[in-house]
């Protein structure tokens, strides 16, 4: 039975040209995290495998940095980075947990962080 929950940074906004940390946290389960996939819509951004380490997709290598922790740092943000981001936690023996983050990249300097929220 899957008892865990994923807490994410929720709906967030950031300035064009700036950087942002995408963060998810899996709680309420003793399942072992084997791999975390970070995806933007249906495009793979990065993978962190418990045994093999990090892989950043070649098309994002210049703008994506691993961490902190299992999170992901997006740099040199453009308006095109606006959209949904998913953290996918592959766990044993529970299975897969998915968290969603919506990022809005703003032209102005009025970029505020949204509230944290939970996805069961």
């Amino acid at each position: 039975m899957m008892t865990g929950t994923i807490e994410t940074t929720g709906n967030i906004s950031a300035e064009k040209g700036g950087s942002i940390i995408l963060q998810c946290h899996l709680s309420s389960t003793t399942a072992q995290v084997t791999q975390v996939n970070w995806e933007q819509q249906d495009q793979l951004l990065a993978i962190c495998n418990a045994d093999l380490g990090w892989h950043i997709s070649p098309s994002f290598k210049d703008r994506v940095a691993p961490g902190p922790g299992l999170g992901l740092t997006l740099q040199s943000l453009t308006v095109n980075d606006t959209g949904e981001y998913f953290c996918i936690y592959h766990t044993y023996p529970d299975g897969t947990y998915t968290g969603r983050i919506f990022l809005e990249v703003l032209e102005s300097s009025v970029a505020e962080h949204g509230a944290r929220f939970q996805i069961p």
Epitope: T34, Q35, N37, E39, D42, Q43, L44, I47, N49, D51, L52, G53, H55, P58, F86, I88, H90, G95, T96, T98
Partner: antibody, heavy 121, light 108 residues
């Protein structure tokens, strides 16, 4: 073109170990991950694990954890898979398979010809 | 782990006919992390399709893949004599990577 040549068939007693080799050519050996997959007689395919390009990182399927060791020798472009504490259920054809991407994508691009391992008392 | 169920177990068809093979996953395989392999007797498997629908290098266009989520299909538009073999689907979304039980395409 990519070529993966595996060692010959083995017959082992229960409790023994077996070490299968896979010699690669036709591509930059240091760039790709190598997987091992096995197939019991008349059965389907079973992923065992993967080893990184430098040999420093490995990831094994839970089922084989503690019994399997994957290594690689860059000087000879060879990957090895050792399975210990053999039992009759380990009788299978063992394949090495190179990954399609420059990471552990899991897409098995090129395969060795297979090595038959028979475990029998 | 993700369990893949292939159907039918055996498909009996004649050369020139269309073959439709199904693969169903026990949970959603995001972003179509699904591959298809062909295996002939006494040979190693060969990669046909990855990403659910992208043909591997050198694979003829009579082979096509489709589907997303939990339901995937491999279609061989017009069977050639060399296409009679066992076909396996594989998910590479969630470790451990797993394979379906296979579909045997045999000559009717």
């Amino acid at each position: 073109q990519v070529q993966l040549v595996q060692s010959g068939a083995e017959v082992k007693k229960p409790g023994a170990s077996v070490k299968v080799s896979c010699k690669a050519s036709g591509y930059t050996f240091e760039k790709y991950y190598m997987h091992w997959v096995r197939q019991a007689p008349g059965q389907g395919l079973e992923w065992m694990g993967v080893i990184g390009p430098s040999g420093a990182s490995t990831s094994y399927a839970q089922k084989f954890q503690g019994r399997v060791t994957m290594t690689r020798d860059t000087s000879t472009s060879t990957v090895y898979m050792e399975l210990s504490s053999l039992r009759s259920e380990d009788t299978a054809v063992y394949y090495c398979a190179r990954d399609h991407s420059d990471y552990w994508s899991g897409i098995l691009h090129s395969w060795g010809q297979g090595t038959m391992v028979t475990v029998s008392s | 782990e993700i369990v893949l169920t292939q159907s039918p177990g055996t498909l009996s068809l004649s050369p020139g006919e269309r073959a439709t093979l199904s693969c169903r996953a026990s949970q959603s395989v995001r972003s179509s992390y699904l591959a298809w392999y062909q295996q002939k007797p006494g040979q190693a498997p060969r990669l046909l399709i990855y990403g659910a629908s992208s043909r591997a290098t050198g694979i003829p266009d009579r082979f096509s893949g489709s589907g997303s989520g939990t339901d995937f299909t491999l279609t061989i538009s017009r069977l050639e004599p060399e296409d009679f073999a066992v076909y396996y689907c594989q998910q590479y979304f969630s470790p451990p990577w797993t394979f379906g039980g296979g579909t045997k395409v045999e000559i009717k």
